[in-house]
């Protein structure tokens, strides 16, 4: 009878084991072990027992002891079970950002590991077990589906293998995959709201505001604002689940035309964009041109108004004929035209909006001097000793210098309050003089003596 010790062994992969083969007869013809494993016999006294060192055990094996005794041949097997932890425990790669409400499939792959009967695969969120299954197949694959929730943000998912050899008197061997950190997000289906001027004049500034509600996590949202090819640098203000990005836009002549204003919000692996058209226009105030800003009375004056080629102008309230960017009027300058304003109003339609610009020029008419009865009466009769103010107003542009003299020397105090005396009586020659010429007018002052009764 052949026996083997130990009859069952569990050992780590690549390990060694001592196997004793024994026989019940004293003088066996043969006693040995049959195995593909490297073996070394340890010398022992007696010939009914042999000890072998089996080394580099890589897989489960069943070495067989055999003996040949006078009463016949017999065999005995020992069962070697090799254990080893998996070589690869891996979660299948996933995008780190996942939208809330999406079903996320976690897939764990396990390569190697034995004995498989003792190997379990566990999928975890943090320390919470999501699924536990025995390792089956090569590679073993275990999957589970998770409905992504907002509170999963930042959670670590991992896969663990458990090789439980405690029933065999050994320990529990654990291997854990690299964690997958889930970043959850909510990007609403509504595009961002964009508030900006629809038209903007060259060399001015405008303000653009882009906002969106219902974001999570709002601090991770990226906002890109651009006008045409110009990057705008917004100041972003965050609420609990909203943001508002405000940027100042300066436009120059280079920007003239139709530009796309875009606001793109990027969160996770999704984006939402709003596009708006902004028309940047150049519209200088119309030009009012007078043949000469200062003319003499009776001169023909041309007043022209010129504006942007696409504008429509009115000059002193009269629309151009035909309606367009130019208007003019002709007039013969009269004293009444001095200081007259010529106002040109130009209207330009920009992207459906009417823009108005005005320009005013004043005409100076040189005339005079003038001395007439209404403003410089030719005859004054005043009682002696009364208080009087001689009045004589000369008209003209430029305003004439006025002097009234009696006998070429005695002045009449124009505009001053005087006590009437006999000396004041007489005929005065009033002379009004300016760069435009001079005029004279005789003024007679009569003094009435008081009656004594």
């Amino acid at each position: 009878q052949t026996s083997v010790s130990p009859s069952k062994v569990i050992l780590p992969r690549g390990g060694s084991v001592l196997v004793t083969c024994s026989t019940s007869c004293d003088q066996p013809k043969l006693l040995g072990i049959e195995t593909p494993l490297p073996k070394k016999e340890l010398l022992l006294p007696g010939n009914n027992r042999k000890v072998y060192e089996l080394s580099n055990v890589q897989e489960d094996s069943q070495p067989m002891c055999y003996s040949n005794c006078p009463d016949g041949q017999s065999t005995a097997k020992t069962f070697l079970t090799v254990y080893w932890t998996p070589e690869r425990v891996e979660l299948a790669p996933l995008p780190s950002w996942q939208p809330v409400g999406k079903n996320l499939t976690l897939r764990c792959q396990v390569e190697g590991g034995a004995p498989r009967a003792n190997l379990t695969v566990v999928l975890l969120r943090g320390e919470k077990e999501l699924k536990r299954e025995p390792a089956v197949g090569e590679p073993a694959e275990v999957t589970t589906t998770v409905l992504v929730r907002r509170d999963h943000h930042g959670a670590n998912f991992s896969c663990r293998t458990e090789l439980d050899l405690r029933p065999q008197g050994l320990e529990l061997f654990e291997n854990t995959s690299a964690p997958y950190q889930l970043q959850t997000f909510v990007l609403p289906a509504t595009p961002p709201q964009l508030v900006s001027p629809r038209v903007l004049e060259v060399d001015t500034q405008g303000t653009v505001v882009c906002s969106l509600d219902g974001l999570f996590p709002v601090s991770e949202a990226q906002v890109h604002l651009a006008l045409g090819d110009q990057r705008l640098n917004p100041t972003v203000t965050y609420g609990n689940d909203s943001f508002s990005a405000k940027a100042s836009v300066s436009v120059t002549a280079e920007d003239e035309g139709t530009q796309r204003l875009t606001c793109a919000v990027i969160l996770g692996n999704q984006s939402q964009e709003t596009l708006q058209t902004v028309t940047i226009y150049s519209f200088p105030a119309p030009n009012v041109i007078l043949t000469k800003p200062e003319v003499s009375e009776g001169t023909e004056v041309t007043v022209k108004c010129e504006a942007h080629p696409r504008a429509k102008v009115t000059l002193n309230g009269v629309p151009a004929q035909p309606l367009g960017p130019r208007a003019q009027l002709l007039l013969k300058a009269t004293p009444e035209d001095n200081g007259r304003s010529f106002s040109c109003s130009a209207t330009l339609e920009v992207a459906g909006q009417l823009i108005h610009k005005n320009q005013t020029r004043e005409l100076r008419v040189l005339y005079g001097p003038r001395l007439d009865e209404r403003d410089c009466p030719g005859n004054w009769t005043w009682p002696e000793n009364s208080q009087q103010t001689p009045m004589c107003q000369a008209w003209g542009n430029p305003l004439p210098e006025l002097k009234c003299l009696k006998d070429g020397t005695f002045p009449l105090p124009i505009g001053e309050s005087v006590t009437v005396t006999r000396d004041l009586e007489g005929t005065y020659l009033c002379r009004a003089r300016s760069t435009q010429g001079e005029v004279t007018r005789k003024v007679t002052v009569n003094v009435l003596s008081p009656r004594y009764e």
Partner: antibody
Framework: QVQLQESGGGLVQLGGSLRLSCAAS????????MSWVRQAPGKGLEWVSA????????YYADSVKGRFTISRDNSKNTLYLQMSSLRAEDTAFYYC????????????WGHGTLVTVSS | SSELTQDPAVSVALGQTVKITCQGD??????ASWYQQRPGQAPVLVIY???SRPSGIPDRFSGSSSGNTASLTITGAQAEDEADYYC????????????FGGGTKLTVLG
């Protein structure tokens, strides 16, 4: 569809003058800025000049400033480039291109016209 | 400076992905636009703004930017993509209105 067709290129003596035209169709010409871009044979692209939609603003590369004049006739849907005091280094294919705004990218290009300045 | 710098030549195997880059100070303020020019033809706009394609341009063309560098990526390059590619931007130095890069010759192998 948008079409831009350059004309007026040809052989010209050193120091001579030439006027290029670009006839446009398929878009509202007066609403678009227009540019000239040139390419010397076997070389890269070089921006030459640009004009706003209204024609009120014009821009030139330093290499052509004072010698070239860009203009447009919105009633004829035509862009022009008047070139004078021509130099050997002005030899190139001249393309006209449109953009939605004066400093903007070029949405459409013409097929180009070759200007050769010979000594 | 008002320069945009591009690699003179880049090659890619058919069906593979290639990235063409463009560097310049103006790209910190302005987005680049990209033009494809096949031999003997006029340039064609392929990318503008942050990453916009005109109609008719295949979605294998995409644009991106970071700092002073703009990139044009062709994912799954086709034989017909063999051409010169030029980047172009507004000139932040104020010397010119717009400025072009020197161009990159793309060769599609296989």
């Amino acid at each position: 569809q948008v079409q831009l067709q350059e004309s007026g290129g040809g052989l010209v003596q050193l120091g001579g003058s030439l006027r290029l035209s670009c006839a446009a169709s398929g878009f509202t010409f007066s609403s678009y800025a227009m540019s000239w871009v040139r390419q010397a044979p076997g070389k890269g692209l070089e921006w030459v000049s640009a004009i706003s939609g209204s024609g009120g603003s014009t821009y030139y590369a330093d290499s052509v400033k004072g010698r070239f004049t860009i203009s447009r006739d919105n009633s004829k849907n035509t862009l022009y480039l008047q070139m004078s005091s021509l130099r050997a280094e002005d030899t190139a294919f001249y393309y006209c291109a449109n953009s939605a705004y004066t400093g903007g990218w070029y949405d459409y290009w013409g097929h180009g016209t070759l200007v050769t300045v010979s000594s | 400076s008002s320069e945009l710098t591009q690699d003179p030549a880049v090659s890619v195997a058919l069906g593979q992905t290639v990235k063409i880059t463009c560097q310049g100070d103006s790209l910190r303020t302005y987005y680049a636009s990209w033009y494809q020019q096949r031999p003997g033809q006029a340039p064609v706009l392929v990318i503008y703004g942050e990453n916009s394609r005109p109609s008719g341009i295949p979605d294998r063309f995409s644009g991106s930017s970071s700092g002073n560098t703009a990139s044009l990526t062709i994912t799954g390059a086709q034989a017909e993509d063999e051409a010169d590619y030029y980047c172009n931007s507004r000139d932040s130095s104020g010397n010119h209105l717009r400025v072009f890069g020197g161009g990159t010759k793309l060769t599609v192998l296989g």
